[in-house]
Interface confidence: low
């Protein structure tokens, strides 16, 4: 009977730790010689299985070859990795008496289709915070799949946004792909509880998409507005001072009061009033004996945000020397301040 | 490859809102990648950014401008529109619009549209 | 706003001329700049997209390098077609702004 080497699958897919069975028969025994299976063609291909009775780590033969009748070449392939990608070939040799053997026929080929998951997506962000208006760029990576069609998009707060750029590597063929993504974001000030979200769909994820997330949260800063203000007494001698600092993010905030310029009072805010969109608000009180001062006194609000430049706000506070009413203070912001507020 | 036709009223009344659209050929603006934009340039000056629209409806617009501008996009007719309310001379320019990729500049314009507000 | 000036305002210079242009953000815009042809009459047209990287189907005697706040335009060898306003624009920070543009003229 004619000899014939027949692979019946082109190709076959399998998930990354599966197995998978290479299906080969042959329609003659003779002539006699082995048949061996190859990952690849040419001088390069790669040796995989020769049913030479040697144990291959993860390859088995399907039958039992030893047997005279046997036609059936087929072998199984366990915990495939990415690795194993590519085509097979079963081959039919003929056995020289002393020169080697000699290849008289190949099966047509199956490929081996790895289908491996990507990992789950890992955002990064600046390593500074940024402010409102600002744009900064955010990098998604995934890494490990294959076949190497991906998906990947970007949202914030549930809206698309269309990356700077996604490269998938390497180009060429390979056992398994990574992919890499950067879009830019305009921060603003209502970003403190948004989210930014890259989402990776791929066919082994079975329309399940990972998801990777970065909270805006550690990536803004958005600086307090800062405002004095002078509360009705509430005693003949006393004036009452008001630092407010309002809608800022992250916590860390230290409030100075300063009296002429000298450092009266050390505030290390602790109960942070939270805003609804996550920001928070902090109001320092400061009393002032008004006995204590016969000239005018400017009261000063020195307020630090996240290791940024000192904001100040100032206020003066006239003397006794300026009234006629010895029971009372007149105050009154410092016009010559950068920004006043009354 | 993409084109872009500004279309409007080239004589607008003071007070009045001003209303522009722009037709894209070539390419669609639903396929995503790029923010579509307006940008004006008064009488020889300068340029002047308006506003970007993404084909999901996302905007960002210029502050001096904001409290007047409305950009919208419609994808059915793979135009965007530019709508300027409450219009004075100084607002007499030719406006652009342009294709906008952060990666790559605004790569496509228009050829520009003078309006002229004047009563 | 993010203040971009531009220098000169205008030049003079005979074909063949190396040209250079500067821009000057108000702050740190990193790479985030756009430099764009403009001539009498005409749309502009971008020429080079993140301070250095030439657009498709601009010829490479135009340059453009810097980041931070100091940037620079160069035309290595000034031809007649050249003959445009030269803006460059920001796209750091929102508002983007451009640069007062800069008027070139052939000696």
């Known amino acids: 009977k004619e000899l014939k080497v027949t692979q019946p699958e082109k190709s076959v897919s399998v998930a990354a730790g599966d197995s998978t069975v290479l299906n080969c028969t042959l329609t003659s025994l003779l002539p006699v010689g082995p048949i061996r299976w190859y990952r690849g063609v040419g001088p390069s291909r790669l040796l995989i299985y020769s049913f030479a009775g040697e144990y291959v780590p993860r390859i088995r033969n399907v039958s039992d070859t030893t047997k005279r009748n046997n036609m059936d070449f087929s072998i199984r392939i366990s915990n495939v990795t990415p690795a194993d990608a590519g085509i097979y070939y079963c081959v039919k040799f003929q056995k020289g008496s002393s020169e080697p053997d000699t290849e008289i026929q190949s099966g047509g080929g199956t490929e081996v289709y790895v289908l491996a998951k990507p990992s789950p997506p890992e955002v990064s962000g600046p390593a500074d915070r940024g402010i409102p208006d600002q744009k900064v760029n955010f990098t998604c990576k995934s890494h490990g799949f294959s076949p190497r069609n991906i998906t990947l998009k970007w949202f914030k707060d549930g809206q698309e946004l269309h990356p700077l750029e996604t490269t998938v590597n390497p180009s060429g063929k390979n056992v398994s792909y990574n992919i890499s993504s950067t879009v830019r974001v305009v921060l603003n000030s209502m970003d403190v509880n948004s989210k930014v979200i890259c989402e990776v769909a791929h066919i082994t994820l079975d329309r399940s998409p990972l998801r990777g997330i970065a909270n805006l949260s550690n990536f803004i800063r958005v600086s307090p507005t800062v405002k004095v203000t002078q509360q009705s007494p509430t005693s003949m001698n006393q004036v009452n001072l008001t630092c407010r600092a309002e809608r800022f993010y992250p916590e860390d905030l230290q409030l100075i009061w300063l009296e002429n310029g000298n450092v009266s009072r050390n505030d290390t805010p602790k109960n942070l009033t939270k805003n609804t969109d996550g920001t928070y608000n902090y109001t320092s009180l400061f009393l002032v004996n008004s006995s204590a001062h016969r000239e005018d006194v400017v009261f000063t609000c020195q307020v630090k945000h996240d290791q940024q430049p000192a904001i100040t706000r100032n206020h003066t506070v006239l003397g006794f020397a300026h009234s006629s009413d010895q029971g009372s203070m007149q105050t009154f912001p410092d016009n010559n301040a950068t920004h006043n507020w009354n | 490859q993409v084109q872009l036709q500004e279309s409007g009223p080239g004589l607008v009344k003071p007070s009045q809102t001003l209303s522009l659209t722009c037709t894209v050929s070539?390419?669609?603006?639903?396929?995503?990648?790029?923010?579509w934009s307006w940008i004006r340039q008064h009488p020889g000056k300068g340029l002047e950014w308006i506003g970007s629209?993404?084909?999901?409806?996302?905007?960002y617009y210029n502050p001096s401008l904001k409290s007047r501008v409305t950009i919208s996009v419609d994808t059915s007719k793979n135009q965007f529109s530019l709508k300027l309310s409450s219009v004075t001379a100084a607002d007499t320019a030719v406006y652009y619009c342009?294709?906008?990729?952060?990666?790559?500049?605004?790569?496509?314009w228009g050829q520009g549209t003078t309006v002229t507000v004047s009563s | 706003d993010i203040q971009m000036t531009q220098s000169p305002s205008s030049l003079s210079a005979s074909v063949g001329d190396r040209v250079t242009i500067t821009c000057q953000a108000s702050?740190?815009?990193?790479?985030?700049l756009n430099w764009y042809q403009q001539k009498p009459g005409k749309a502009p047209k971008l020429l080079i997209y993140?301070?250095?990287n030439l657009a498709t189907g601009v010829p490479s005697r135009f340059s453009g390098s810097g980041s931070g706040t100091d940037f620079t335009f160069t035309i290595s060898s000034l031809q007649p077609e050249d003959i445009a306003t030269y803006y460059c624009?920001?796209?750091?920070?929102?508002?983007?702004?451009f640069g007062g543009g800069t008027k070139v003229e052939i000696k």
């Open positions: 342009a294709r906008e990729g952060y990666h790559s500049g605004m790569d496509v």
């Open positions: 070539g390419g669609s603006i639903s396929s995503g990648g790029y923010y």
């Open positions: 629209i993404y084909y999901s409806g996302s905007t």
């Open positions: 993140d301070a250095s």
């Open positions: 624009q920001q796209f750091a920070y929102l508002p983007w702004t």
């Open positions: 702050q740190d815009i990193s790479n985030y």
